[in-house]
Interface confidence: medium
Amino acid sequence: QPPPPPPDATCHQVRSFFQRLQPGLKWVPETPVPGSDLQVCLPKGPTCCSRKMEEKYQLTARLNMEQLLQSASMELKFLIIQNAAVFQEAFEIVVRHAKNYTNAMFKNNYPSLTPQAFEFVGEFFTDVSLYILGSDINVDDMVNELFDSLFPVIYTQLMNPGLPDSALDINECLRGARRDLKVFGNFPKLIMTQVSKSLQVTRIFLQALNLGIEVINTTDHLKFSKDCGRMLTRMWYCSYCQGLMMVKPCGGYCNVVMQGCMAGVVEIDKYWREYILSLEELVNGMYRIYDMENVLLGLFSTIHDSIQYVQKNAGKLTTTIGKLCAHSQQRQYRSAYYPEDLFIDKKVLKVAHVEHEETLSSRRRELIQKLKSFISFYSALPGYICSHSPVAENDTLCWNGQELVERYSQKAARNGMKNQFNLHELKMKGPEPVVSQIIDKLKHINQLLRTMSMPKGRVLDKNLDEEGFESGDCGDDEDECIGGSGDGMIKVKNQLRFLAELAYDLDVDDAPGNSQQATPKDNEISTFHNLGNVHSPLK
């Protein structure tokens, strides 16, 4: 073993190094001292360190460690934050498009139902957005409210346009009749199933991404214990006290120290792995009725089909409702049922469909692939940090926490540390409370992700078939029952042109087939229907 360099009689080198951390000379001895008051950098002879310097080194070491941890997680953090924001915005765009397609369907096929239909559709999709973002809203209630609101308008505008204003108090009766008589057939239930499944999955997907951010943020801002600070100080700074400025810590020694400091953090590893694999499973199942893009962009078509179903049965319904709601009316009114064709605008509205452009689905899969490259992030952290901080290559001529050694020996280093403090003891203390909390949250989200794992094979419950869909109501596989039908439909494929759309606001006035320009972004809010937390100023 090479002899240590002669001590610096004036502590000049140590002083100039220390001044970078702490301007001023007051804490550095002018000449080497016995150092009997030192607690971390225990000297074997005279030393150029004081107790105050040691404290400063500890503080700096912990700050260094926090910065190293933050830079280690920067790429992962950015990946999740960026994707959470992108997906949240993308989901909002899907909702906005779905609303606009639905409004366009009403505008082109049932102009007499607007603007009330716009209002009900707007409220429904506002609830959809809120649900995705975590609001405590029941999807079935949302769908029921949509159909409950629509039916009185359909009845008074399409089926019985002869009703005078004085008869509008039958609305409550009509809302009740809507469910009792199943006037829309099984379409509301179908929509409930599709919307609740797709939104539940979307919501948990966003929840999981946001929890991912929380996990990284928690570990990113961990405050390291004093014991860890002492270990880091010994590794990074105690060599300075002996005038060994250019010596690097041994690699093996760094790993031991980092494992000790990160013992609590590494405990996240098991749950983090499970999180990524569960998220992958969720994403793999996000198709057909578990894909909100697919479901919501096809909703207008199912709603259109449901109105056609009402029209098909208008004669029978008008008679029944006439009796059921008779007490609400002064007299019976003639049914004004017309052949379905009169309600269909024959214009075919087209939405561009680009087969190979990036979709939400491909973006999700891409995210999972990137996340999987971070599956060992927590278990690999100690090694990562050591590889990104100065350590001696091949463990030769390096600092082992006590002295300069030609080759690092873990056993020797451990023996030398016995009097100072026990690494094993540090590991046994268990994780920080914040780490325990985040582990609990990971366990919870993993459980949720597992319960959300999609059934294989046929997707919808069989009981939908038993509820009596007439042939032609929806097709053989209800799972697919979200596409367009009828000439008046907007042809929509499940291909949201994802990134291109992010900067684009489609509104009713921009809806396919409508040339009216919106200026500037005229779709935003209406004085009458969408004033947030103010009472409607309607007269």
């Epitope: 607007t114 506002t126 009216q516 935003e524 809010i525 004085t527 004033l531 309607l538």
Partner: antibody, heavy 115, light 112 residues
């Protein structure tokens, strides 16, 4: 090109009513709310109310306590603002403006209330 | 009613110099849909008001890029990077989220 053309200046006696028209062109009249804003001489802008021509829905500034009535005629793409029980302080330029953001304004109609 | 307070009420500026107008609302103008409905208008002498900025920071088409809007919640600012002679007039901020919609008192920009 979106255009809002208002009726000409009016001179009225206190207690009378005035009806100002605003003819819209260059867009689908029934798709956009029409709002009315007034400006007394040397003063700022004051919102009076609005109508959605498509639905007939109206909203009013309660400050006018039922003196203002806004209507729309879809067949002629024209909106109307009628102000009754005129007082001298109602002397102002009355503007129609298309919502949202009032990107388009009429040229204004000066209503003078004088005994 | 929402009160919109503008400062200053008068703003003498030398051509080529920047100018800044502040507008404060008595309540947040953030809608539940996330947008903030604050507009800025310029009314030149003898003309109707013209839209400059909508939703806090979006320049209306045809508005020179020397005009910019910023702010959030209740505090908003209109900035003109280099004032030109044609910019004289009264500037108004306005909210269109709560009925009745309201305007600021106006800021008169004049050339020194």
């Amino acid at each position: 090109e979106v255009q809002l053309v208002q009726s000409g200046a009016e001179v009225k006696k206190p207690g009378a009513s005035v009806k100002v028209s605003c003819k819209a062109s260059g867009y689908t009249f029934s798709d956009y709310e029409m709002h009315w804003v007034r400006q007394a001489p040397g003063q700022g802008l004051e919102w009076m109310g609005a109508i959605h021509p498509g639905s007939g829905d109206t909203a009013y500034n309660q400050r006018f306590k039922g003196r203002v009535t806004i209507t729309a005629d879809k067949s002629t793409s024209t909106a109307y603002m009628e102000l009754s029980s005129l007082r001298s302080e109602d002397t102002a330029v009355y503007y129609c403006a298309r919502f949202y953001s009032y990107a388009y304004w009429g040229q204004g109609t000066l209503v003078t209330v004088s005994a | 009613d929402i009160v919109m307070t503008q400062t200053p009420l008068s703003l003498p500026v030398t051509p080529g110099e920047p100018a800044s107008i502040s507008c404060r609302s008595s309540q947040s103008l953030v809608h539940s849909n996330g947008n903030t409905y604050l507009q800025w208008y310029l009314q030149k002498p003898g003309q109707s008001p013209q839209l400059l900025i909508y939703k806090v920071s979006n320049r209306f088409s045809g508005v020179p890029d020397r005009f910019s809007g910023s702010g959030s919640g209740t505090d908003f600012t209109l900035k003109i990077s280099r004032v030109e002679a044609e910019d004289v007039g009264v500037y108004y901020c306005s909210q269109s989220i709560y009925v009745p919609y309201t305007f600021g008192q106006g800021t008169k920009l004049e050339i020194k």
